[in-house]
């Protein structure tokens, strides 16, 4: 049976040319991190972090993605384009695929609220 | 290329203790977890636990909690599974398997216990 | 605890035959994985998430399956495919099928 929890940075908002921190993080179970993968919205790959190969950014991405803090993805330079879901994918052994989900709405407005709280979604 | 080398057959008595060892090559051992399955002659395979090989942490199936120990030698890429106080039932060969979808286990270790 | 049935237990197959081996489970898994074993040989992954070919695998062995049915089917059955197969799934407690031994006539 699978243990763990996925908790998130689950709703957040960042001001548009900002940053902002993907956060996702995995709890209450003994398995072994093999890999994780980010992912956006319409189901491209923005990131991996692989245990043994280390962190991967896609080309289309590498501009404007940094790796971290810890497993986490910063999404730097945000625009408009950049507002909708995010998905972080744990494959361990022996649980298999733990998912967690993010909403990112990137707010043209100065006084975008930065929410950093962590949720289970 | 990625290997896992188990050491040779083992010929014990009951009571006995033996350690059988699984020495990976070819990718970053603490990258995986290790799992040990037994097999009995004639019968499937049965799943026996695994170990952290990050943190070190074995966690055991119920049906080898007791007697089973799984341990590591990091520096030399090596995992262990010791079985202490033998009994016939014992007799089977052992596999180390890499904890992921890549396929990849030892060659086997066969262990005997006999009076 | 998963456990995991296969079906039949014993098949016998001719030369060129299509052939599908099954593995229910009692409750519902997210993957399986196939493995081949021959006598005195370690397991050899065939098919590993259900229906992903394992490198040097023969086109020939495909998998598919949801839920709590899962199947491993052989194309053409040669003479080298004559071997046990077994299904394994993780899911916290990984299990083994009781396993499928494959007859060539």
């Known amino acids: 049976m699978m243990t763990g929890t996925i908790e998130t940075t689950g709703n957040i908002s960042a001001k548009k040319g900002g940053s902002v921190i993907l956060q996702c993080h995995l709890s209450s179970t003994m398995a072994q991190v093999t890999q994780v993968n980010w992912e956006q919205h319409d189901h491209s790959l923005l990131a991996i972090r692989n245990a043994e190969l280390g962190w991967h950014i896609y080309p289309a991405f590498k501009d404007r993605v940094a790796p971290g803090p810890g497993l986490g993805l910063t999404l730097q330079s945000l625009t408009m384009n950049d507002t909708g879901e995010y998905f972080c994918t744990y494959h361990t052994y022996p649980d298999g695929t733990y998912r967690g989900r993010i909403f990112l709405e990137v707010l043209e407005s100065s006084v975008a609220e930065h929410s950093a709280r962590f949720q289970i979604p | 290329q990625i290997q896992l080398v188990q050491s040779g057959p083992e010929l014990k008595k009951p009571g006995e203790t033996v350690k059988i060892s699984c020495k990976a090559s070819?990718?970053?051992?603490?990258?995986?977890?290790m799992s040990w399955v037994k097999q009995t002659p004639g019968k499937g395979l049965k799943w026996m636990g695994w170990?952290?090989?990050?943190?070190?942490?074995?966690t055991y199936a119920d049906d080898f909690k007791g007697r089973f120990a799984f341990s590591l030698e990091t520096s030399a890429s090596t995992a262990y599974l010791q079985i202490n106080n033998l009994k016939n039932e014992d007799t089977a060969t052992y596999f180390c398997?890499?904890?992921?979808?890549?396929?990849?286990w030892g060659q086997g270790a066969t262990l005997t216990v006999s009076s | 605890q998963i456990v995991l049935t296969q079906s039949p237990a014993i098949m016998s197959a001719s030369l060129g035959e299509e052939i599908t081996l099954t593995c229910s489970a009692r409750?519902?898994?997210?993957?399986m994985h196939w493995y081949q074993q021959k006598s005195g040989t370690s397991p050899k992954l065939l098919i590993y998430?259900?229906?992903n070919l394992a490198s040097g695998v023969p086109s020939r062995f495909s998998g598919s399956g949801s839920g709590t049915f899962f199947s491993l089917t052989i194309s053409s059955v040669e003479a080298e495919d004559a071997a046990d197969y077994y299904c394994?799934?993780?899911?916290?407690?990984?299990?083994f099928g009781g396993g499928t031994k494959l007859e060539i006539k």
């Open positions: 398997t890499r904890g992921d979808t890549g396929g990849y």
């Open positions: 070819g990718y970053t051992f603490t990258a995986y977890g």
């Open positions: 170990i952290n090989t990050y943190s070190g942490v074995p």
């Open positions: 409750s519902s898994v997210s993957d």
């Open positions: 998430s259900t229906s």
């Open positions: 394994h799934q993780w899911g916290g407690y990984p299990t």
